[in-house]
């Protein structure tokens, strides 16, 4: 990653997963004290409000539409003449939700489990989603898993969370192959509670097992 430490850092506030019609602030930070930035979209439909524009640290985008979904980068500069732009930032994926009906989310063996018991979350819908995405405490995470047709006519994905330690609130989203950053409405939230011999807890949840390869869109 040549020159990586000089690159700006692009992030989203409050989240890179944005409901349709909502707003998101894109922030470009740096170690070099850049005072102005340009922002561009790498894929999908161009966003006219960004074209040939210069920003100071941040830009509020919205109300977002499906056209805003995609991969963004920023470049920084000091306002010299002529302006010299930095190397591009890290890529930032903006996901737009609320574009399809919500899937349903359930837990096996159930939403209340004993400490150490294996938990699997199943996301399903009658809509022919290609992919499901799991969210925890309102934050989007990987893993994402392909939807598999099931015998009852739904399309389903099973997320193994591994042995339960703490509880948490989960939702899931569906998406299609040709628009991977355009997601459905969230499922109804599912509260997973963990009971132990000494106490029960549904607060202070730990992250899902790293074995599932979970990554955040936003740091």
């Amino acid at each position: 990653h040549e020159g990586g430490q000089d690159k700006p850092l692009l992030s989203a506030w409050p989240s890179a997963v944005v409901p349709r019609g909502g707003h998101v602030t894109l922030l470009c930070r740096s170690r070099l004290g850049f005072t102005i930035f340009s922002l561009y979209k790498e894929d999908g439909v161009p966003v006219p409000e960004l074209y040939n524009k210069i920003f100071w640290k941040s830009i509020l985008m919205g109300p977002v539409t499906p056209a805003h979904a995609g991969t963004y980068r920023c470049r920084g500069s000091h306002p010299r003449s002529p302006i010299e732009w930095s190397a591009p930032s890290n890529p930032l994926v903006i996901v737009v939700t609320g574009l399809f009906g919500k899937p349903s989310l359930s837990a096996q063996p159930g939403p209340t489990v004993r400490t150490g018991e294996n938990v699997t979350l199943s996301c399903s819908s009658r809509s022919s989603f290609d992919m499901y995405h799991l969210s925890r405490e309102g934050r989007a995470h990987e893993p994402r898993l392909p939807a598999v047709p099931s015998v009852n006519g739904t399309f389903q994905a099973d997320f193994p969370l591994g042995p339960a330690t703490h509880g948490g609130t989960y939702t899931c989203f569906g998406s299609l192959h040709d628009s991977p950053y355009e997601w459905s409405d969230p499922s109804d939230p599912l509260l997973v509670s963990v009971t132990g011999n000494s106490s029960s807890s549904s607060s202070s949840p730990t992250e899902p097992s790293s074995k599932t390869g979970i990554r955040r869109h936003l740091h």
Epitope: G3, Q5, D6, W13, R29, R31, G33, F34, K57
Partner: antibody
């Protein structure tokens, strides 16, 4: 495990030069920038600047331009802070720290410099 | 430059008590705030980043909160090893600045 190990305490006279080292281990040295922080006796923390461990390019905070120089010996995974023409007000503990997403996750143990 | 105002400057508390230290910034830094603990004669140790993300290994009695310009770190059920100095730092971009520090002492 990740460690930043700094050189030992220094006692110098005004006008002299000091060079403090910070040896990094346990990670890929060129993947993370290195910062320097000053703490005067009984005072708080003051950011001095940073060095790009890929390119060797330094960036100095406004109060540390002129007499201060950051450098690297990449093959030895070591960063250096040199202060020229020492003054009494340079008496402090100096820390190196590793930067991840613009905050500092690992710090050296500090090098105490006394100018007297 | 972003100014960081930390309060209180010093604080006396007993083991088992709960304390809160606050940090105010001169401009919106969203959630880009870190907290450090420094014990006498030692280097600072990162406790919290992104305003509320606890570093692995830091006891759960510590919690960070806030966004925008108002932030705090709360320590529940103080333990003897929690006493020392605490500093906030914005990680929004250079120049980095630290709060003036809070000295947490045993009552």
């Amino acid at each position: 495990q990740i460690q930043l190990v700094q050189s030992g305490p220094e006692l110098k006279k005004p006008g002299e030069t000091v060079k403090i080292s910070c040896k990094a281990s346990g990670y890929t040295f060129t993947d993370y920038s290195m910062h320097w922080v000053k703490q005067a006796p009984g005072k708080g923390l003051k950011w001095m600047g940073w060095i790009n461990t890929e390119t060797g390019g330094p960036t100095y905070a406004d109060d540390f331009k002129g007499r201060f120089a950051f450098s690297l010996e990449t093959s030895a995974t070591t960063a250096y802070l040199q202060i020229n023409n020492l003054k009494n007000e340079d008496t402090a503990t100096y820390f190196c720290s590793r930067d991840v997403d613009l905050y500092f996750d690992y710090w050296g143990q500090g090098t105490t410099l006394t100018v007297s | 430059d972003i100014q960081m105002t930390q309060s209180p400057a010093s604080l006396s508390a007993s083991v088992g008590e709960t304390v809160t230290i606050t940090c105010r910034t001169s401009e919106n830094i969203y959630s880009y705030l870190a907290w450090y603990q420094q014990k006498q004669g030692k280097s600072p140790q990162l406790l919290v980043y992104n305003a509320k993300t606890l570093v692995e290994g830091v006891p759960s009695r510590f919690s960070g909160s806030g966004s925008g310009t108002q932030f705090s770190v709360k320590i529940n059920s103080l333990q003897p090893e929690d006493f020392g100095n605490y500093y906030c730092q914005h990680h929004y971009g250079i120049p980095f600045t630290f709060g003036g520090g809070t000295k947490l002492e045993i009552k």
